[in-house]
Interface confidence: low
Amino acid sequence: LQDLCSNCPAGTFCDNNRSQICSPCPPNSFSSAGGQRTCDICRQCKGVFKTRKECSSTSNAECDCISGYHCLGAECSMCEQDCKQGQELTKKGCKDCCFGTFNDQKRGICRPWTNCSLDGKSVLVNGTKERDVVCGPSPADLSPGASSATPPAPAREPGHSPQ
């Protein structure tokens, strides 16, 4: 049999008991698709959550985090405390980044400074708790007599032996 509940549009529910129309979703509930037999309860943005978008009969409320917190998870399912730049959140609260690490955001963990020498470069600007180091040209590039016109060595395709 054809499911005639498909007649009920979003914002209503198909009530086969008492209602003689497709019943509108009650206050604080919604149905985002047609043919629903119930409406879903609207999400409430309470506590550390604040409302970014009000609930309507056809769509759920959307939450943000209050000042000092940031969203985590799909659809901002959690709020996590902000820290300052140069800090990371631990179980004991916000802690300064250890020497050699940095965090340039209010969220996330401290990450190690870039190791310039791995790329054969030198440190141009030292790192801080808030900023990564800035790598500069390699020391050899800066030696007297080095020609800036020297073309770079051609890159080899993987799996090919040098000619």
Epitope: L1, Q2, L4, C5, N7, C8, P9, C14, D15, N16, N17, R18, S19, Q20, I21, C22, S23
Partner: antibody, heavy 119, light 107 residues
């Protein structure tokens, strides 16, 4: 297949209470509302009311509140409409029809019973 | 009660014609509009429900459209078997109400 069977014609004397029947088959009788619709000769259609066979809950058009009484017999999957004190104004074709829930359409109709009120 | 008005009570058309029958509600019925066909022998069938959805077994030459208070039924290629009276009906609010019908005849 879904069927709503109604007698083709009924004759009743003015003032003599009578019942029209509608026998349903081909679907779960208790899951669909049975509705009754009136059509006077050469006129449009008027919704009288409906009944939910599962618990006999009824809704009536105020215009027919004192005229029609809807009942069902679940054991025989039959719906009834009793008309009180019939007059010539009640001479019409009466259709039974079903619907699944409130705003869904009347998806299947009986053939209609022609009621003649005459002495 | 919601009044349903079919301004054209009868309509003549030729076989193969495209025919449009209109229906107006006295208030917004949010697309809860159904169309029925009543043959000369009294048989009534559902054609279209919720403004534009074709009931199972109904030929695709029938279509419906509209919104708010204005709705229409279109038969794209009129056939002999389409000779009937067509009724609109609102399913928005109790009591359910029908239009007065449009009788379709062949020229």
């Amino acid at each position: 297949q879904v069927q709503l069977q109604q007698p083709g014609a009924e004759l009743v004397r003015p003032g003599a209470s009578m019942k029209l029947s509608c026998k349903a088959s081909g679907y779960t009788f208790t899951s669909y509302w049975i509705n009754w619709v009136k059509q006077r000769p050469g006129q449009g259609l008027e919704w009288i009311g409906n009944i939910y066979p599962s618990d006999s809950y009824t809704n009536y058009n105020q215009k027919f509140k004192d005229k029609a009484t809807l009942t069902v017999d679940k054991s025989s999957s039959t719906a009834y409409m009793q008309l009180s004190s019939p007059t010539s104004e009640d001479s019409a074709v009466y259709y039974c029809t079903r619907l699944y829930y409130g705003s869904s359409p009347f998806d299947y109709w009986g053939q209609g019973t022609t009621l003649t009120v005459s002495s | 009660d919601i009044q349903m008005t079919q301004t054209t009570s009868s309509l003549s058309a030729s076989l193969g014609d495209r025919v449009t029958i209109s229906c107006r509600a006295s208030q917004d019925i949010s697309n809860y509009l159904n169309w029925y066909q009543q043959k000369p022998d009294g048989t009534v069938k559902l054609l279209i429900y919720h403004t534009s959805r074709l009931h199972s077994g109904v030929p695709p030459r029938f279509s419906g459209s509209g919104s708010g208070t204005n709705y229409s039924l279109t038969i794209s290629n009129l056939e002999q078997e389409d000779i009937a009276t067509y009724f609109c009906q609102q399913g928005h609010t109790l009591p359910r109400t029908f239009g007065g019908g449009t009788k379709l005849e062949i020229k």
